[in-house]
C-alpha cells in the first residue's frame, strides 16, 4: 500500500533508503533539456516476490524539443538551494541489501536522468536522514523514519535528527561504521 | 493530507474563453506531474494532458491541442487549464489529477449555454 | 491510440458475491494499468496501480491482476458500498486512455 505523502523533511537534511519495498514507484524523470519519451513508462516499479525482486519498466529520456512557451513555471527559490529529498549522488551499496526479501537494490541511473529521484514509498519503508555537508547531526535518538498504517491511514514517523551548521557531515547507517548497518533489524518492526 | 482543490463551476457563452485552477496541497508540488481529465455523460473519462511543474513541460493528447493549454505557478502550487473558443462539446467536468492519478481532485463543471 | 474495452457496461450483484470486471487494451502495456472507481456525484478514486498494486485505504476485497492486453478487477465479498462505476486506465503510453466503464448495480 502506497504511503499517502512523502517522508517528513528535516531542515538541512536528506534521507535515502537502503533498499526499497516491493510496490515502491520510481518516477522516470529526466533532466532539463530532455523529457521522457512519449511511449516510455511513467515510473519504475519494484515487483517481484519473496526471493526475488526488481526493478520493472525502464526509463528513457529524449531530447526536448518542444517547451513550454508560457513562463509561470519557476522554481522556489528554496529549491534551487537544497534538495530535500533523494539526489542521484554515488549510490552506496550495504553488502546485505541484496539478500533482503521483497527489496530492490537502488536502480542504475538511466541516460539523462534528473538529479533528483522521486519514489513513491510503500508502507513499512524506511528511509534513513543526513545531514547535508556543513551541517553536523545531533541525534536524540534515530535518524530514520519509517511509513506506518494507523486507522487505514498512512504516517511517517518523525525522525530524531537536528542537524546544526558546523562544518561536519554525518554519515547514512552502514557508510561509516558496518556493525550499525539497519539491515539488520528485524522487518517486522517496520511493517503493519 | 494530499489535497487537490479545483476551482468552482462556470456557465459560459459559446465561443469564449475559460480558465480552471487546481491548487495542491500536502506533497511537494514540483515533483509531481498534474494531469487534466474530461468527463462527460456517455464519453467517459478522456485524458486531455499533463504539465510538469518543475521541468516546465506539458504533454496534450493530440485531440485537446489548440484547445486547452495547461500553465502551473509553483509559488501557489496552483496548475491552471484554459480552454478557449468553447462549444456545447466542452460542457464537462473537467479534473485534476496528482502523484501518478493517486489523488483527483473534486472537479470543475463547466457549462457552455448561451 | 490505446484503445481500452470494458465490454461490460453494466453488471448485477448481490451482497457477499465475488464479482470481476474486465479490461481489454488494443496494444500491450506491460501493466502499467491503473483502475478507479466512481460513485454518483464524487471524483474518481484510484484503487489499484501497476495492475495488482492496491492503494492504501483500499480493502483488500479488491484485487488487480493481468499483464499485456488483458486485466481483471475482482471484487470479492461485495458490499453495498461497492455499487459504483469501474474505470481501467492505461498510462504505458501518450495519450493516456480509459475504458469506458463499467457500472455494478444490485441485482
Known amino acids: 500500500e502506497l504511503c499517502d505523502d512523502d517522508p517528513p523533511e528535516i531542515p538541512h537534511a536528506t534521507f535515502k533508503a537502503m533498499a526499497y519495498k516491493e510496490g515502491t514507484m520510481l518516477n522516470c524523470e529526466c533532466k532539463r533539456g530532455f523529457r521522457r519519451i512519449k511511449s516510455g513508462s511513467l515510473y519504475m516499479l519494484c515487483t517481484g516476490n519473496s526471493s526475488h525482486s526488481s526493478w520493472d519498466n525502464q526509463c528513457q529520456c529524449t531530447s526536448s524539443a518542444t517547451r513550454n512557451t508560457t513562463k509561470q513555471v519557476t522554481p522556489q527559490p528554496e529549491e534551487q538551494k537544497e534538495r530535500k529529498t533523494t539526489e542521484m549522488q554515488s549510490p552506496m551499496q550495504p553488502v546485505d541489501q541484496a539478500s533482503l526479501p521483497g527489496h530492490c537494490r537502488e536502480p542504475p541511473p538511466w541516460e539523462n536522468e534528473a538529479t533528483e529521484r522521486i519514489y513513491h514509498f510503500v508502507v513499512g519503508q524506511m528511509v534513513y536522514y543526513q545531514c547535508v555537508q556543513g551541517y553536523r547531526a545531533l541525534h536524540r535518538g534515530p535518524a530514520e523514519s519509517v511509513c506506518k498504517m494507523t486507522h487505514g491511514k498512512t504516517r511517517w514517523t518523525q525522525p530524531q535528527l537536528i542537524c546544526t551548521g558546523e562544518m561536519e557531515t554525518s554519515q547514512f547507517p552502514g557508510e561509516e561504521k558496518p556493525q550499525a548497518s539497519p539491515e539488520g533489524r528485524p522487518e517486522s518492526e517496520t511493517s503493519c | 493530507q494530499v489535497q487537490l482543490q479545483q476551482s468552482g463551476a462556470e456557465l459560459v457563452r459559446p465561443g469564449t474563453s475559460v480558465k480552471m485552477s487546481c491548487k495542491a496541497a500536502?506533497?511537494?508540488?514540483?515533483?509531481?506531474?498534474i494531469g487534466w481529465i474530461k468527463q462527460r455523460p456517455g464519453h467517459g473519462l478522456e485524458w486531455i494532458g499533463d504539465i510538469h511543474p518543475g521541468g516546465d513541460y506539458t504533454n496534450y493528447n493530440e485531440k485537446f491541442k489548440g484547445k486547452a493549454t495547461l500553465t502551473a505557478d509553483t509559488f501557489s502550487s496552483t496548475a491552471y487549464m484554459q480552454l478557449s473558443s468553447l462549444t456545447s462539446e466542452d460542457s464537462a467536468i473537467y479534473y485534476c489529477?496528482?502523484?501518478?492519478?493517486?489523488?483527483w481532485g473534486q472537479g470543475t463543471l463547466v457549462t457552455v449555454s448561451s | 491510440d490505446n484503445v481500452l474495452t470494458q465490454s461490460q457496461k453494466f453488471m448485477s450483484t448481490s451482497v457477499g458475491d465475488r464479482v470481476s470486471v474486465t479490461c481489454k487494451a488494443s496494444?500491450?502495456?506491460?501493466?502499467?494499468v491503473a483502475w478507479y472507481q466512481q460513485k454518483p456525484g464524487q471524483s474518481p478514486k484510484a484503487l489499484i496501480y501497476s495492475a495488482s498494486y492496491r492503494y492504501s485505504g483500499v480493502p483488500d476485497r479488491f484485487t488487480g491482476s493481468g499483464s499485456g492486453t488483458d486485466f481483471t478487477l475482482t471484487i470479492s465479498n461485495v458490499q453495498s458500498e461497492d455499487l459504483a462505476e469501474y474505470f481501467c486506465?492505461?498510462?504505458?503510453?501518450?495519450?493516456?486512455?480509459f475504458g469506458g466503464g463499467t457500472k455494478l448495480e444490485m441485482k
Open positions: 489529477t496528482g502523484r501518478n492519478f493517486a489523488y
Open positions: 486506465q492505461q498510462y504505458n503510453s501518450y495519450p493516456y486512455t
Open positions: 496494444q500491450n502495456v506491460g501493466t502499467n
Open positions: 500536502g506533497y511537494t508540488f514540483t515533483n509531481y506531474w
